[in-house]
């Protein structure tokens, strides 16, 4: 039965993954494995991850006689050692005119006046620090605020008494309050002049404004 079915250990080679077969006896062989493989026929890829050096939160992925790192979004490079420049990647990372500043492992926004938050999307509530007089209503604006005054009060902060309350303007004149000093301003109808619109004027002159 013998000679027609002679077993030749290395023909064909049982070594896989590029391993080289060497006959060591009539029925025995040895595989010399390429780096990164082990086993009697070089069938196992050696796990290189136990000795990995993935940095900055990178996760090891085994390769052949090496390893690779799967990096978090803020990092790149073979070992996650290179900082991603989010400011280049996302030109609109900072909103409302904010300036993007790249940092190791992230980025920050330097917001323009009136805006806050990680991406400058939050309008700062200026009313939180406003000094509108009690009884008035604060309205938040971008980097500013305005005070809505109750009847009888005037001025930017509603801290002045409204001079128009006493109806100082005569002859159907319009009364406005100067927001800086609270004094009244009369806009006289045609034919009248003076601080209170009590004086007649020559024909030909139209509306007059008088401050008091």
């Amino acid at each position: 039965a013998g000679s027609d079915s002679l077993y030749v250990p290395c023909a064909p080679s049982p070594c896989v993954n590029g391993g080289t077969c060497r006959q060591t006896g009539d029925f025995t062989f040895e595989c010399n494995c390429l780096p990164g493989f082990e086993g009697s026929t070089c069938e196992r890829n050696i796990d290189d991850c136990p000795n990995h050096r993935c940095q900055n939160g990178g996760v090891c992925v085994d390769g052949v006689n090496t390893y690779n790192c799967r990096c978090p979004p803020q990092w790149t490079g073979q070992f996650c050692t290179e900082d991603v420049d989010e400011c280049l990647l996302q030109p609109n990372a900072c909103q409302n005119g904010g300036t993007c500043a790249n940092r190791n492992g992230g980025y920050g926004c330097v917001c323009v006046n009136g805006w806050s938050g990680d991406d400058c999307s939050e309008n700062i509530d200026d009313c939180a620090f406003a000094s509108c007089t009690p009884g008035s209503t604060c309205i938040d604006r971008v980097a500013s605020f305005s005070c809505m005054c109750p009847e009888g009060k005037a001025g930017l902060l509603c801290h002045l008494d409204d001079a128009c309350i006493s109806n100082p303007c005569h002859k159907g004149a319009l009364c406005d309050t100067n927001p800086l000093n609270g004094q009244y301003i009369c806009t006289c109808p045609q034919g009248y002049k003076g601080a209170d619109c009590t004086e007649d004027v020559d024909e030909g002159n139209s509306h007059h404004h008088h401050h008091h």
Epitope: D48, P50, R53, Q55, N56, G57, T66, Y67, T81
Partner: antibody
Framework: EVQLVESGGGLVQPGGSLKLSCAVS????????MEWIRQASGKGLEWIAA??????????VYSASVKDRFTISRDTSKSTLYLQMNSLKTEDTAVYYC???????????WGQGTLVTVSS | DIQMTQSPSSVSASVGDRVTITCQTS??????LAWYQQKPGKSPKLLIY???RLQDGVPSRFSGSGSGTDYTLTISSLQPEDFATYYC?????????FGGGTKVEIK
């Protein structure tokens, strides 16, 4: 400012034990790999143990020369790295440094070192 | 383990000289190489990481180059404070390994 300060070194007999501490400050301790390196008098640097960061589950690696004898650990609440050394041998005599692996495959901050002498 | 062969083991040089130290690794470390300076009684200090990147605060006379298995540290113009021992270290995988050191001495 990043600072690492080792303590706990001293004279110990062969077969004895010693626990080294490394108090750290100036950085988020759990974010970094930490290493222990030693240097025998007049010799070169020898890495002996590492603990990876929180993102890597604080996993641990040892050199063959200290495996099963030394234990690296950290207490994040105390910002302290430790090296428990058991079954000490005369060849363990060295200055022991703790160092921070700065996220660039390099050791960017080192302590001042603490001397361990194993002698009878 | 990755073997590190650093040469020369010592070099005598004068202030102003250009000094070159080489480090060869037993396998490709993908530029994961660092260089350190150590003075007597002091801790090592990181000079170069990633084979060629200068650590913050390190003078520009120090430079690193190389890839694969061959790396070089160059001091372009030696200064009095540069007399020390220099070590290379691979950071590609554990165990971390160091070169044997190069002592730069005054000629």
């Amino acid at each position: 400012e990043v600072q690492l300060v080792e303590s706990g070194g001293g004279l110990v007999q062969p077969g004895g034990s010693l626990k080294l501490s490394c108090a750290v400050s100036g950085f988020t301790f759990s974010d970094f790999y930490m290493e222990w390196i030693r240097q025998a008098s007049g010799k070169g640097l020898e890495w002996i143990a590492a603990q990876r960061n929180k993102a890597n589950d604080f996993s641990i690696v040892y050199s063959a020369s200290v495996k099963d004898r030394f234990t690296i650990s950290r207490d994040t609440s105390k910002s302290t790295l430790y090296l428990q050394m058991n079954s000490l041998k005369t060849e363990d005599t060295a200055v022991y440094y703790c160092s921070r692996d700065g996220g660039k495959l390099a050791l960017d901050a080192w302590g001042q070192g603490t001397l361990v002498t194993v002698s009878s | 383990d990755i073997q590190m062969t650093q040469s020369p083991s010592s070099v005598s040089a004068s202030v102003g000289d250009r000094v070159t130290i080489t480090c060869q690794t037993s396998e490709d470390i993908y530029s994961g190489l660092a260089w350190y300076q150590q003075k007597p009684g002091k801790s090592p200090k990181l000079l170069i990481y990633g084979a060629s990147r200068l650590q913050d605060g390190v003078p520009s006379r120090f430079s690193g180059s190389g890839s694969g298995t061959d790396y070089t540290l160059t001091i372009s113009s030696l200064q009095p404070e540069d007399f020390a021992t220099y070590y290379c270290q691979q950071g590609f995988k554990y165990p971390l390994t160091f070169g044997g050191g190069t002592k730069v001495e005054i000629k």
